[in-house]
Amino acid sequence: EEELQVIQPDKSVSVAAGESAILHCTVTSLIPVGPIQWFRGAGPARELIYNQKEGHFPRVTTVSESTKRENMDFSISISNITPADAGTYYCVKFRKGSPDTEFKSGAGTELSVRAKPSAPVVSGPAARATPQHTVSFTCESHGFSPRDITLKWFKNGNELSDFQTNVDPVGESVSYSIHSTAKVVLTREDVHSQVICEVAHVTLQGDPLRGTANLSETIRVPPTLEVTQQPVRAENQVNVTCQVRKFYPQRLQLTWLENGNVSRTETASTVTENKDGTYNWMSWLLVNVSAHRDDVKLTCQVEHDGQPAVSKSHDLKVSAHPKEQGSNTAAENTGSNERGSSDYKDDDDKHHHHHH
């Protein structure tokens, strides 16, 4: 009679996480009598997976009925596979004794577990940044196996190239994580922009996972200011407006100063939204000219999103004409926008009135 051989026909088996793994094992002889055991790994630290003779193995079932006469099939099924189950499994024949002794081992079957990556999480900088600045976004995904994975970055559908990606750990592991950092240059038009991290893996069957970050959470577009004098609305009154244009986010506080003294403070509430996602707002100030003997310096001061205030001034000349003539002095705009100005089309805004 030929000596018993333990046959493990599959060198490797790949299973998706959550599924069952079938590990095949047959023996070529009924001799010697003795149980089969399955181990993960070899050597003294090997882990017992199944023992035909004794023990409780809730995740393991035998594929064939091992009690049946002349049974030589000792294949097992392991349920609910996780990445932690990856490894090489050995089917080992034992010889009956006190205790049973190891007789012969199969060549082993390597079980690899295909585990899907977690949904990518994209995070941006802690503080907002202004256009023309470069900001970093990170993307993380965990728990995938095998190690091979592809990560791409997009901004509004356009693939980015300035990024660095690491997959950890470097050596063998039951599962892996990916971490990528991309650099993105902000523009004034980015309020509606999205940064997308896309992860492709063998477990996803060509349907990559995506994580997104809205640049509206990252960008700050500072306002441009323009102070103008409007035609007289009533005798001895001058109407001055402060146009606050193209700002984001909405959080904005405006203060009017007359000759350096605070006249009024208000918070932007009813704003108009531009197509690019930025906001416009307008504030009015009605100045009673007859109450002033000297020229008035009007300043529109804006604090946007907690940043240092920007301001724009307007000099209002008070003439010596008698009041009864009812003529208003022409105003001269001598101020300058400290942040620079642009020629943007403005949407209508709510007019705020204030009488002195």
Partner: antibody
Framework: QVQLVQSGAEVKKPGASVKVSCKAS????????INWVRQAPGQGLEWIAM????????HYNQIFKDRATLTTDTSTSTAYMELRSLRSDDTAVYYC????????????WGRGTLVTVSS | DIVLTQSPDSLAVSLGERATINCRAS??????????IFWYQQKPGQPPKLLIY???NRDSGVPDRFSGSGSGTDFTLTISSLQAEDVAVYYC????????FGQGTKLEIK
């Protein structure tokens, strides 16, 4: 190690029934067949029947088919053999034995239960 | 049914001598490449003990002075050098079909 512990001796009257138990330990009860064998005083071994505790499949010696019933309780790893309509020639030591190789052989034996049938 | 006949019914052998017990089946017990014959030893007041399985394979812990041979219908249990502790009744059993035992052979010391 494998152990099969049998119930104590019984004295029965002709026509009665007896139920002998065999409690297994040291192995997974449902993975191996249990055989029942008897031996009358001064006589040879006589196979009665066998049971697979995993699914209660049984095989009986035709001689005992109508009088013997094998059962198992997997929750307590115990096998039972009931013999009905007892006669005086059923007086014997009744053994349970475990088949470790699914070869329909008897690898490990209990110590036996003496059943005496006498009026 | 297969009937097993052992011979002799009893046997007396001197210590250190060879003892041979025969078992003949009424039909072949060979199947699937195996001879489905088993040998047991039973000492007084004890349950039987498996010695040989599938005709020629010694069970664990069985001294190597015990050996089994044969094929088809004729089988032999041999004790190469009889020891005092070998005094017992020896049974053959077949399981090509359902188990049946031979009538037993009583081995004594001459």
């Amino acid at each position: 190690q494998v152990q099969l512990v049998q119930s104590g001796a019984e004295v029965k009257k002709p026509g009665a029934s007896v139920k002998v138990s065999c409690k297994a330990s040291g192995y997974t009860f449902t993975n191996y067949w249990i055989n029942w064998v008897r031996q009358a005083p001064g006589q040879g071994l006589e196979w009665i029947a066998m049971i697979d505790p995993s699914d209660s499949e049984t095989h009986y010696n035709q001689i005992f088919k109508d009088r013997a019933t094998l059962t198992t309780d997997t929750s307590t790893s115990t096998a039972y053999m009931e013999l009905r309509s007892l006669r005086s020639d059923d007086t014997a030591v009744y053994y349970c034995a475990m088949d470790y190789g699914s070869l329909y052989a008897m690898d490990y034996w209990g110590r036996g239960t003496l059943v005496t049938v006498s009026s | 049914d297969i009937v097993l006949t052992q011979s002799p019914d009893s046997l007396a052998v001197s210590l250190g001598e060879r003892a041979t017990i025969n078992c003949r089946a009424s039909q072949s017990v060979r199947s699937s490449g195996y001879n489905w014959i088993f040998w047991y030893q039973q000492k007084p007041g004890q349950p039987p003990k498996l010695l040989i399985y599938l005709a020629s394979n010694r069970d664990s812990g069985v001294p190597d002075r015990f050996s089994g041979s044969g094929s088809g219908t004729d089988f032999t249990l041999t004790i190469s050098s009889l020891q005092a502790e070998d005094v017992a009744v020896y049974y053959c059993q077949e399981s090509r079909e359902l188990p049946t035992f031979g009538q037993g052979t009583k081995l004594e010391i001459k």
